[in-house]
């Protein structure tokens, strides 16, 4: 028996359902009574779901997993993982035993899009050219950790005097705060881009300083 899984990681958004694909080629005359199937976490070998003795033994993992019972006899041993969490990320092994045995591992990559950045200035009034100003770009509830880029109005990257911090909340999602310290010119636009490296999703925020008033 040969077990096949997708070589590319499965990308799943937080709180959505994901399918970890696994298949095998049943011999002629195969019946589910002959099948033993185990899904487990590859690293810890923690049991996730099993099928044996002709029966679905159910989820051993947060009661959020399910097989596709009608498709098993065709060799579809895929696992459905419901309401995906950040902690579900990792490698899962599909182990199939009939008169022979084989296994293969599939990776689950969890992702969550970042919110549109909010921009704040400090100080935020009585600004004049030559003043040192702190611009903070904040984006929330994303996963995995973001990449943050700053640019000026001409699209020139601003790399000096940037401090970025990322803090995970209780669900494992990250809040990003990136601080740019610049000396103001006569007027200018400062934009921040928060990129989710897995989703290739970019969230933009900008602030334009034109003497008075400020535009966000």
């Amino acid at each position: 028996v040969e077990v096949q899984v997708s070589e590319d990681p499965v990308v799943a958004l937080v709180d959505t359902d994901a399918t970890l694909r696994c298949s095998f080629s049943p011999e002629p005359g195969f019946s589910l009574a002959q099948l033993n199937l185990i899904w487990q976490l590859t690293d810890t070998k923690q049991l996730v779901h099993s099928f044996t003795e002709g029966r679905d033994q159910g989820s051993a993992y947060s009661n959020r997993t399910a097989l596709f019972p009608d498709l098993l006899v065709q060799g579809n041993a895929s696992l459905r993982l419901q309401r995906v969490r950040v902690t579900d990320e990792g490698s899962y092994t599909c182990f199939v035993s009939i008169q022979d045995f084989d296994s293969a591992a599939v990776s689950l990559q969890v992702a969550a899009p970042y919110s549109k950045p909010s921009m704040t200035l400090e100080p935020n009034k009585d600004l004049r050219p030559g003043n040192m100003v702190t611009i903070t770009c904040s984006s929330y509830q994303g996963y995995p950790e973001a990449e943050v880029f700053w640019k000026d109005g001409q699209g020139v990257p601003l790399t000096g005097n940037v401090t970025t911090s990322q803090m995970a909340n209780e669900r494992g999602l990250f809040d990003v705060h990136s601080v740019l310290r610049v000396v103001l010119g006569a007027n200018g636009t400062y934009s921040c881009l928060v990129r989710n490296p897995v989703l290739q999703q970019d969230a933009h925020g900008s602030v334009t300083i034109t003497g008075q008033p400020l535009t966000f």
Partner: antibody
Amino acid sequence: EVQLLESGGGLLQPGGSLRLSCAASGFSFSSYGMHWVRQAPGKGLEWVAAINSDGSRIYYADSVKGRFTISRDNSKNTLYLQMNSLRAEDTAVYYCTKYYYHYAMDVWGQGTTVTVSS
Amino acid sequence: QSVLTQPPSASGTPGQRVTISCSGSRSDIGATTVNWYQQLPGTAPKLLTYQSHLRPSGVPDRFSGSKSGTSASLAISGLQSEDEADYYCASWDASLNTWVFGGGTKLTVL
């Protein structure tokens, strides 16, 4: 008739090497997983290693990992166990077994005796 | 020390029914199944039951296996003198990725 016939056992000193063979007949050898199981004198059964039909998936007991190598030659209908760095505690009768549904072993050879002693 | 736990010995008189237990865990018997082997003195083991309760052809129906949760048992009814042997339970352990045997139970027919 389905048969498994082990050979290659013997007496050797600690640190020595030995290769066991298991000749299979009476069934489609290349379609089945195979195991080695051992039994020390007066003791119970201990699973040693398993290999799937095409040799792509192999498992070992912790007690032999890194020292023993299971392999197969489907063209010769033969299963092998290469045993290196042998220890006194490897002394046992070694059985070759055919894999069956539900993790079972439905056919066993008569066993070959390996004695490791100085 | 075996992953599956069996009593070291059991006994019964001819005609009696005896039961041998095998205790495992969520990752072996609980997740998969259990198989039983009989080893008569001086011979190789023989598969007695598989998938917890099925018998290979040639095994008398006096032998019956069952499983409940993480435990299993082998019942032998109408005990006969030729049933005197060592009995082993076995399973696949998903947390170890190994096949595992119980320590064996020596059955004596009195």
